[in-house]
């Protein structure tokens, strides 16, 4: 991974584009920290394992987060 100690936040760009929950392998929500003062959302896609930084402020992404948490709560007993 092209990381150096000076890189503070993971996302160079963020995407507003809606993501189909079915095409998601994983969704990571990285809370703000001393290294990066903003929340970062990283989606790992099933196709080729592509990772995409998502815009936490986007309506489409907020809807995605709701859909994913709904799906998780369905699965958990």
């Amino acid at each position: 991974v092209p990381l150096s100690r000076t890189v503070r936040c993971t996302c160079i760009s963020i995407s507003n584009q809606p993501v189909n929950p079915r095409s998601l392998e994983k969704l990571e929500i990285i809370p703000a920290s001393q290294f990066c003062p903003r929340v970062e959302i990283i989606a790992t896609m099933k196709k080729k394992g592509e990772k995409r930084c998502l815009n936490p402020e986007s309506k489409a992404i907020k809807n995605l987060l709701k859909a994913v948490s709904k799906e998780r709560s369905k699965r958990s007993p």
């Epitope: 890189v7 993971t10 160079i12 963020i14 990772k51 995409r52």
Partner: antibody, heavy 124, light 109 residues
Framework: QMQLVESGGGVVQPGRSLRLSCTAS????????MHWVRQAPGKGLEWVAV????????FYVDSVKGRFTISRDNSKNTLYLEMNSLRAEDTAIYYC?????????????????WGQGTTVTVGS | EIVLTQSPGTLSLSPGERATLSCRAS???????LAWYQQKPGQAPRLLIY???SRATGIPDRFSGSGSGTDFTLTISRLEPEDFAVYYC??????????FGPGTKVDIK
């Protein structure tokens, strides 16, 4: 459509300064990292600098560190390159380029939108 | 620092022929970080391939990318007249920096 327009190039004497601008339209500028890439006459492409979408990180090629500063004003949809202590070897076409949607340190989507470039000539 | 080498320097082919362009890295590069660009005289570069093998938006399917580790390839299955240009590979590396190869010129035989 997505567009980037560079300005501010010109002829300048060695040791002097110049500020390049790049104005974006057709996309949400504040969502994308931005780059400056240059091309000396008859030569290949050389990456110069990058700035994260929110300005959180900035990085430079070694040859311009301490002389050039990349910055952005998201309220004006504009990217800048402040060039100080210019040298003859800085003579080039300077392009601004958009970092692809969703790029991060774990996956790189390439520079997907480019301006037409502005020419900087350093010489006496 | 990773150095990219492209070969051949110039490729002379006829329209309709297959073009195979090579990009070699001095150290292993994750395929997630490799891109290819096309540049025609007097024009800005254009992104063709990212992630070593994914075509950028609007790029015809005659362009394909492959490879991993230190060896990457851009293939143009059947050259069209508009494909004669210079092609650059590029990698995103640590620090982070974004390095371009020296380019391969594809010209008409």
């Amino acid at each position: 459509q997505m567009q980037l327009v560079e300005s501010g190039g010109g002829v300048v004497q060695p040791g002097r300064s110049l500020r390049l601008s790049c104005t974006a339209s057709g996309f949400t500028f504040s969502n994308n990292g931005m780059h400056w890439v240059r091309q000396a006459p008859g030569k290949g492409l050389e990456w110069v600098a990058v700035i994260w979408f929110d300005g959180m990180n900035k990085f430079y090629v070694d040859s311009v560190k301490g002389r050039f500063t990349i910055s952005r004003d998201n309220s004006k949809n504009t990217l800048y390159l402040e060039m100080n202590s210019l040298r003859a070897e800085d003579t080039a076409i300077y392009y601004c380029a958009r970092e692809g949607d969703g790029s991060g340190i774990y996956y790189y989507y390439g520079m997907d939108v480019w301006g037409q470039g502005t020419t900087v000539t350093v010489g006496s | 620092e990773i150095v990219l080498t492209q070969s051949p320097g110039t490729l002379s082919l006829s329209p309709g022929e297959r073009a195979t362009l090579s990009c070699r890295a001095s150290q292993s590069v994750s395929s997630s970080y490799l891109a290819w660009y096309q540049q025609k005289p007097g024009q800005a570069p254009r992104l063709l391939i990212y992630g070593a093998s994914s075509r950028a938006t609007g790029i015809p399917d005659r362009f394909s990318g492959s490879g991993s580790g230190t060896d990457f390839t851009l293939t143009i299955s059947r050259l069209e007249p508009e494909d004669f240009a210079v092609y650059y590979c590029q990698q995103y590396g640590s620090s982070p920096i974004f390095t371009f190869g020296p380019g391969t010129k594809v010209d008409i035989k």
